[in-house]
C-alpha cells in the first residue's frame, strides 16, 4: 500500500510529450487552410533536486534549484521548450489569397529545466 | 470580504522578481572565493490567454495557451528566463589556486512565457 | 485586369436547383478564395460560403449546410455554385468574387411556381 | 457566428462634409480581417477597405478605414457626389463570414 502511494506521488522528470494541434479545435481552421494541424508536442515533468545533465538546464537553473532546496519559497526551474523547429503553412491573407508561410518556433524537439 | 478573497485568487502576470543570492546559503561559498552572493533574480507568474506582447512568448507557446484554454489536461505555458546574463567570480581548483572565470547564463535579465 | 463573367439569369421551379458559373480571365484564380454572396431584393449582402480551387477546399455558411455545393475547374478557371431545394426565398442576385476585390456582374436567381 | 451591427442605419449629409460610419462585432475579428464595400443600385459591391485599413487599388484617399477588435470605422473625408451609396462591412476571419446590414449614405 505503502509502495503503491509512493508510485503515484513519483512525479516523471521533465520530458516531451505527444499534442497533436488540430486547428479546427482552436478556431484557427478559418485562416490555416492547410495543414488541418500538426504534431507540436509540449513540455512537462519534474525539474528535481539535483538537476541531472540530460534536463539541459542553465547555470541559472542550477542555482534556482538549489535555492528551491533550501527555501521553498522560491520556485524550482520550469519544463519547457528548449529547441523549436518551423512548419510551413498555406494560410489566407488578408485580400483571402492562398500564401504559403514558414511560422518560426512552432513544434517541440526538445525540452529542459529553465 | 469577497474583494480581499478575489484580490487574493488574482495570480500577477509573468516577470521578474528579486533574489539575492547567498554562496554560504547554498553551500558554495567552500569553492567560490568572491563574491559572497550575487542577483541573480528569477522568473514567476502567469502566462493566461491570451498571451499579450510583452510576455515574450514564441508561437509553440501561444499555441499551447490556446490549447489549454480549450483543454486544461494540457499545461499552460511556464514563465522562465528568456535572457540571461554573465557574471565573472573568482574560485578555488582542484589545485586551490584561484582562478577568475565567466560564468554564463547566471543573472536573469528578461522573463517570457514559454 | 483580372475579370469574374458569371452566367446568365435563371427561373426556377420550387424544390429544383441551380447552378451558376463564375469564369475567370486575365489573372490568377486558383489560388484566391472564390467566394459566393448572394442579395435578395431590397435586402442586404448575404454570405454562402468560399472555395479555395488549389486545394479544393469549401467552406459554407450553417444557413446554406447541405444545400449548397461549391467546386472549380482549376483548367477553365472556373468557379461553380449549386443551389439545391430551391423555395421562393432564395429569390436573389447571386455573385462570386475572387478574394476581397474582384467581383461577377452578379446572376439575377428567380424562384417561381 | 459573428454579428456585425452598422450605424447609423441611414446617415443624410451634403457634398463635402465629412461621413464617419461605424462597425461594431458582438466578438472580436481576427487578425483584423474586415473589409468594407460600396454598393449602388443596380452594381455589385465595390471594395474599398480590407484588412481592416488598407485601401483597395483604384480607391480614392478621401476614403480610410480604421480600428480592431470589435470596433472599426469608415470614414469619407470629403463627400463627393459619387460616393452616396449603401456601405456594408463584413468580418472574414471566422467562419462563417459575416456582413453588417449596410449604412445608407444619403444626399442631404
Known amino acids: 500500500q505503502a509502495k503503491h502511494k509512493q508510485r503515484k506521488r513519483l512525479k516523471s522528470s521533465c520530458k516531451r510529450h505527444p499534442l497533436y494541434v488540430d486547428f479546427s479545435d482552436v478556431g484557427w481552421n478559418d485562416w490555416i487552410v492547410a495543414p488541418p494541424g500538426y504534431h507540436a508536442f509540449y513540455c512537462h515533468g519534474e525539474c528535481p533536486f539535483p538537476l541531472a545533465d540530460h534536463l539541459n538546464s542553465t547555470n541559472h537553473a542550477i542555482v534556482q534549484t538549489l535555492v528551491n532546496s533550501v527555501n521553498s519559497k522560491i520556485p524550482k526551474a520550469c519544463c519547457v521548450p528548449t529547441e523549436l523547429s518551423a512548419i510551413s503553412m498555406l494560410y489566407l491573407d488578408e485580400n483571402e489569397k492562398v500564401v504559403l508561410k514558414n511560422y518560426q518556433d512552432m513544434v517541440v524537439e526538445g525540452c529542459g529545466c529553465r | 470580504q469577497a474583494k480581499h478573497k478575489q484580490r487574493k485568487r488574482l495570480k500577477s502576470s509573468c516577470k521578474r522578481h528579486p533574489l539575492y543570492v547567498d554562496f554560504s546559503d547554498v553551500g558554495w561559498n567552500d569553492w567560490i572565493v568572491a563574491p559572497p552572493g550575487y542577483h541573480a533574480f528569477y522568473c514567476h507568474g502567469e502566462c493566461p490567454f491570451p498571451l499579450a506582447d510583452h510576455l515574450n512568448s514564441t508561437n509553440h507557446a501561444i499555441v499551447q495557451t490556446l490549447v489549454n484554454s480549450v483543454n486544461s489536461k494540457i499545461p499552460k505555458a511556464c514563465c522562465v528566463p528568456t535572457e540571461l546574463s554573465a557574471i565573472s567570480m573568482l574560485y578555488l581548483d582542484e589545485n586551490e589556486k584561484v582562478v577568475l572565470k565567466n560564468y554564463q547564463d547566471m543573472v536573469v535579465e528578461g522573463c517570457g512565457c514559454r | 485586369q483580372v475579370q469574374l463573367v458569371q452566367s446568365g439569369a435563371e427561373v426556377k421551379k420550387p424544390g429544383s436547383s441551380v447552378k451558376v458559373s463564375c469564369k475567370a480571365s486575365?489573372?490568377?484564380?486558383?489560388?484566391?478564395?472564390i467566394s459566393w454572396v448572394r442579395q435578395a431584393p431590397g435586402q442586404g449582402l448575404e454570405w454562402m460560403g468560399r472555395?479555395?480551387?488549389?486545394?479544393?477546399?469549401?467552406q459554407y455558411a450553417q444557413k446554406f449546410q447541405g444545400r449548397v455545393t461549391l467546386t472549380a475547374d482549376k483548367s477553365t478557371s472556373t468557379a461553380y455554385m449549386e443551389l439545391s431545394s430551391l423555395r421562393s426565398e432564395d429569390t436573389a442576385v447571386y455573385y462570386c468574387?475572387?478574394?476581397?476585390?474582384?467581383w461577377g456582374q452578379g446572376t439575377m436567381v428567380t424562384v417561381s411556381s | 457566428e459573428i454579428v456585425l451591427t452598422q450605424s447609423p442605419g441611414t446617415l443624410s449629409l451634403s457634398p463635402g462634409e465629412r461621413a464617419t460610419l461605424s462597425c461594431r462585432a458582438s466578438?472580436?475579428?481576427?487578425?483584423?480581417?474586415l473589409a468594407w464595400y460600396q454598393q449602388k443600385p443596380g452594381q455589385a459591391p465595390r471594395l474599398l477597405i480590407y484588412?481592416?485599413?488598407s485601401r483597395a487599388t483604384g480607391i480614392p484617399d478621401r476614403f480610410s478605414g480604421s480600428g480592431s477588435g470589435t470596433d472599426f470605422t469608415l470614414t469619407i473625408s470629403r463627400l463627393e457626389p459619387e460616393d452616396f451609396a449603401v456601405y456594408y462591412c463584413?468580418?472574414?476571419?471566422?467562419?462563417?463570414?459575416?456582413f453588417g446590414q449596410g449604412t445608407k449614405l444619403e444626399i442631404k
Open positions: 472555395i479555395i480551387p488549389i486545394l479544393g477546399i469549401a
Open positions: 466578438q472580436s475579428v481576427s487578425s483584423s480581417y
Open positions: 468574387a475572387r478574394g476581397k476585390d474582384i
Open positions: 484588412g481592416a485599413s
Open positions: 486575365g489573372g490568377t484564380f486558383s489560388s484566391y478564395a
Open positions: 463584413q468580418q472574414y476571419g471566422s467562419s462563417p463570414c459575416t
